[in-house]
């Protein structure tokens, strides 16, 4: 049975040319996340993979960053991402839960809210810890 | 300029064991994960499992889980799988093929490694 | 597991033609797809990743198109040395899943 739940950050609304992070989270169940799969409407984002690391599609590849965690940083917003997105998380036993994230892409100078997100630098303590640059897998 | 580079080929009795190498040079061994697929009578592909050089981390198709193991030798940029309890159902060509910068498919394969299972 | 079908197992044509391979997928892979070129005796070579992006070097009669189940790769003109097996593989989901190949053979 499954009794996970997908906790995602809902609506949000954030500036063009700015950045946002996508996050969800799954709680209430003791499956294992083997990978999540990030999706906008029709159009694969991003895979993340628990041993395998990240894919990141080839038509987002200059704007969208992996992570934090699970997450991804959709950076260089326009107007045309404004949308559902879905975090599609494969699990074993339980199987797939999905996440459903809606992002308004605002022309304004303020955004409601989910606004101006800080991009993770990339330091790290040492290459160990440094993500791979291949199918972006971490250690 | 990238290279996989596997071991000879072998020739195995059933119910033992073989163990393929895959040296790499060209690039940062541990910044790309390993994937290994078995080819058996010239056509059909099918996906052993991958590692992850940096941290060993391994997924395996379920297929296979259990009978191969992935390891990897940082120090000699080296990928090895291994295969137990042989059949003859496991004489293939076996490669190891590398993915790209962050996208999972296979841009570099090793020359393949031929197996037989013969009594 | 994906299932990923080819439904030519081969397939005959000849210089100069254009030639549609097709793969199908069990379940929705989304753009997850790539398409390898292997010739006889040699190892699969990358030509087209994400469903449509052909790979570095690639000649650009080479295409793939498609999104969710259905998949084409197309050569848009037949060279002679098109000659070979091609694979389409989903890495949607692991097990990452292969077709069972279609071999274009030239008339």
């Known amino acids: 049975m499954m009794t996970g739940t997908i906790e995602t950050t809902g609506n949000i609304s954030a500036e063009k040319g700015g950045s946002i992070i996508l996050q969800c989270h799954l709680s209430s169940t003791t499956a294992q996340v083997t990978q999540v799969n990030w999706e906008q409407q029709d159009q694969l984002l991003a895979i993340c993979n628990a041993d395998l690391g990240w894919h990141i599609s080839p038509s987002f590849k200059d704007r969208v960053a992996p992570g934090p965690g699970l997450g991804l940083t959709l950076q260089s917003l326009t107007v045309n991402d404004t949308g559902e997105y879905f975090c599609i998380y494969h699990t074993y036993p339980d199987g797939t839960y999905t996440g459903r994230i809606f992002l308004e892409v605002l022309e304004s100078s303020v955004a409601e809210h989910g606004a101006r997100f800080q991009i993770p630098t990339g330091d790290y303590k040492d290459d160990d810890d440094k993500p791979n640059k291949g199918s972006g897998t971490t250690s | 300029e990238v290279q996989l580079q596997q071991s000879g080929p072998e020739l195995v009795k059933p119910g033992a064991s073989v163990k393929i190498s895959c040296k790499t040079s060209?690039?940062?061994?541990?910044?790309?994960?390993m994937h290994w697929v078995k080819q058996s009578h010239g056509k059909n592909l099918e996906w052993i499992g991958g590692i992850n050089p940096n941290n060993g981390g391994t997924s395996y198709n379920q297929k296979f889980k259990g009978r191969a193991t992935l390891t990897v030798d940082k120090s000699s940029s080296t990928a090895y799988m291994e295969l137990r309890s042989l059949t003859s159902d496991d004489s293939a060509v076996y490669y190891c093929?590398?993915?790209?910068?962050?996208?999972?498919?296979?841009?570099?394969w090793g020359q393949g490694t031929s197996v037989t299972v013969s009594s | 597991d994906i299932v990923m079908t080819q439904s030519h197992k081969f397939m005959s044509t000849s210089v100069g033609d254009r030639v549609n391979i097709t793969c199908k997928a069990s379940?929705?892979?989304?753009?997850?797809v790539a398409w390898y070129q292997q010739k006889p005796g040699q190892s699969p070579k990358l030509l087209i990743y994400s469903a449509s992006y052909r790979y570095t070097g690639v000649p650009d009669r080479f295409t793939g198109s498609g999104s969710g189940t259905d998949f084409t790769f197309t050569i848009s003109s037949v060279q002679a040395e098109d000659l070979a097996v091609y694979h389409c593989q989903q890495h949607y989901i692991t097990p990452w899943t292969f077709g069972g190949g279609t071999k274009l053979e030239i008339k």
């Open positions: 060209g690039y940062t061994f541990t910044e790309y994960t």
């Open positions: 093929a590398r993915p790209g910068w962050y996208n999972y498919a296979m841009d570099y």
């Open positions: 379940q929705g892979v989304s753009t997850a």
